[in-house]
Interface confidence: medium
């Protein structure tokens, strides 16, 4: 069953020209979901074996980190990875993480996109694809934005698209990125992509957004069947998380009620994820999704910040990229107030929507996303939403 996703009311985003690309977003008071509820088990997670294959399991190489692969696997057969829970304590996951280029036989580079004042939302996905419109703009700091994207320099050119057959649209954060779906202050000038059409259903044809100058060299239409147009008469948000409910084969069964303390779920159920994402509510088979942030060890110091990348305390020189000053922290750690701290610790909300932050050896920060009940989350930081409806 094709699932649909969006990042919390973000269906597509508009880049406004003339704005410094690396200032914190203005007028955005939204707060990220807090860390996992107290009492949740953050023990190590053993992934089932098996090769990564198919569109959902694409391993992508970050164009910004030369020669170093990063992982975004929906149902990863991590084999054995040394992971660290949010506290930074090492947790062993058996076996060895395969490098993406070994799995795919090639490195996958996201294509460049010409600068555009507006990035229209991607069209409806074809069955089997998952659409990941524009990740939610990180709220914590430019540092986190920079670390998350893994770029050695900010790219003000606009959205970055990951390799097409993953179908993930990941725009570079900019201070004035706003939701096309969110019309406040636009006075009718904003244009949104109404992606409410259920995947696989025929799209309508009226009011197509103007995408001239925005389509990359490989056409978006190669990825998806059609554009589902924005409904000009609907000036309220048109976010696919809210728009439609995914189809399921069986009627909903009773799910367990929240227990005292309001824990999200018994995390023990999450320790061995299944290979089938987006199970309907009440199936009793919640799954998790892991997403690695691009490695940070080649990033150097952070522009406009006193935080630099350094080795973890007590482990000088370990996992250092070649540098003259040796001031870099290990992957997934950043220098903060003179010491290397895990991004998981530094940013308690690093993984959105209740995702759990882990550190994976030689990979960096890793988010394990909740995939239960009516919605589940994916993306490098669990920022994207997929409904089980």
């Amino acid at each position: 069953v094709p699932a649909r996703e969006a990042g919390s009311a973000v269906e597509a985003e508009e880049l406004v020209k003339g704005s410094p690309a690396w200032e914190p977003p203005a007028n955005d008071t939204r707060e990220e979901a807090g860390p996992p509820a107290a009492g949740e088990d953050e023990a190590s997670w053993t992934a089932p074996g098996g090769e990564l294959a198919g569109p959902e399991e694409v391993l992508q190489e970050s164009a910004a980190v030369t020669g170093t692969a990063w992982l975004e696997a929906d149902s990863p057969g991590l084999g054995g990875v040394t992971a660290e829970a949010g506290s930074g304590d090492a947790q062993a996951l058996p076996a060895t993480l395969q490098a993406p280029h070994e799995v795919l036989g090639q490195s996958i580079m996201p294509p460049a996109i010409p600068e555009a004042t507006e990035a229209s939302g991607p069209p409806s996905p074809t069955p089997g694809d998952k659409l990941s419109p524009a990740s939610e703009l990180p709220k914590e700091s430019p540092l986190e934005v920079w670390l998350n994207l893994g770029g050695s320099t900010p790219d003000p050119q606009g959205p970055e698209l990951t390799y097409p057959f993953q179908g993930t649209l990941e725009p570079q954060p900019a201070s004035d990125i706003i939701d096309i779906d969110y019309f406040e202050g636009l006075d009718g000038e904003g244009r949104g992509a109404d992606l409410g059409s259920f995947p696989g259903s025929p799209g309508t044809s009226e009011n197509h957004p103007d995408t001239e100058g925005e389509t990359p060299s490989w056409s978006l239409l190669d990825l998806y069947d059609d554009f589902t147009p924005f409904d000009e008469s609907d000036f309220y948000p048109t976010t696919s998380f809210y728009d439609d409910l995914d189809e399921e084969e069986e009627e909903e069964e009773d799910d367990k009620d929240a227990v005292g303390g309001g824990d999200l779920e018994d995390e023990n159920e999450l320790l061995v994820p299944t290979g089938k994402p987006g199970l309907g509510p009440g199936t009793g088979q919640p799954t998790s999704r892991w997403h690695a942030v691009p490695p940070q060890h080649t990033l150097g110091s952070v522009p406009g910040s006193s935080i630099a990348l350094r080795p973890r305390p007590g482990e000088p020189g370990r996992d250092l990229a070649s540098s003259e000053n040796g001031t870099e922290c290990r992957s997934g750690f950043v220098r903060h107030n003179g010491s290397c701290r895990s991004v998981c610790d530094l940013f308690p909300s690093y993984c959105h929507n209740g995702g759990q932050c882990y550190l994976v050896e030689n990979i960096g920060a890793f988010c394990r996303c909740n995939t239960q009940d009516y919605i589940w989350h994916k993306g490098m930081r669990c920022e994207s939403i997929i409904t089980d409806f």
Partner: antibody
Framework: EVQLLESGGGLVQPGGSLRLSCAAS????????MSWVRQAPGKGLEWVSA????????YYADSVKGRFTISRDNSKNTLYLQMNSLRAEDTAVYYC?????????WGQGTLVTVSS | QSALTQPASVSGSPGQSITISCTGT?????????VSWYQQYAGKAPKLIIF???KRPSGVSNRFSGSKSGDTASLTISGLQAEDEADYHC???????????FGGGTKLTVL
């Protein structure tokens, strides 16, 4: 302009049945999940049921599960709520609303009174 | 399926600012950024005024703002006006069985 117009409410005895309809216009009906939300007199809002754009998935609040059935006819741009085994506590204004969680458009509501 | 908790009533004078709270749990308000607020005049249908914790739909006055801290979401109305007198309902996505949870509603009186 998006419009939702409910009908079918009225007075019914406990144990009786009613079928509510919601005629939609101004948007691509089949592209959106639709919901029923009710409001008992002097009370807050209560989500009742939701249905996917194609009608393939339906969800219900526990309080109505097994008694109410949500459906839609996309060719007629109409949403339905079949209510059986009605109880006094089902007395409320029933609203149809666009989408399933973020209700950006609402109908004017139709009053269902369950009383003997 | 207990509702989100809102104060039954709040009042304020014209020009003042008032805040209406909406308290839930980690399975709803605290766990997700999917809190919405609706304004409802007597005898009328609700109207969306805030979504995703703090976003305003087009046409909604910027005197309305939303925020969230932990288990509690808040709606703040600044520069209170007579036409703000209405009922205000919060809602949140909720995990486990019930995807949409509403608050009990808060009656705002402008003195």
């Amino acid at each position: 302009e998006v419009q939702l117009l409910e009908s079918g409410g009225g007075l019914v005895q406990p144990g009786g049945s009613l079928r509510l309809s919601c005629a939609a216009s101004g948007f691509t009906f089949s592209s959106y999940a639709m919901s029923w939300v009710r409001q008992a007199p002097g009370k807050g809002l209560e989500w009742v049921s939701a249905i996917s754009g194609s009608g393939g998935s339906t969800y219900y609040a526990d309080s109505v599960k097994g008694r109410f059935t949500i459906s839609r006819d996309n060719s007629k741009n109409t949403l339905y709520l079949q209510m059986n085994s009605l109880r006094a506590e089902d007395t409320a204004v029933y609203y149809c609303a666009k989408k399933w969680n973020l209700f950006d458009y609402w109908g004017q509501g139709t009053l269902v009174t369950v009383s003997s | 399926q207990s509702a989100l908790t809102q104060p039954a009533s709040v009042s304020g004078s014209p020009g003042q600012s008032i805040t209406i709270s909406c308290t839930g749990t980690s399975t709803d308000v605290n766990g997700y950024n999917y809190v919405s607020w609706y304004q409802q005049y007597a005898g009328k249908a609700p109207k969306l005024i805030i979504f995703d914790v703090s976003k305003r739909p087009s046409g909604v006055s910027n005197r309305f703002s939303g925020s969230k801290s932990g288990d509690t979401a808040s709606l703040t109305i600044s520069g209170l006006q007579a036409e703000d007198e209405a009922d205000y309902h919060c809602s949140s996505y909720r995990r486990l069985r019930l995807p949409v949870l509403f608050g009990g509603g808060t009656k705002l009186t402008v003195l």
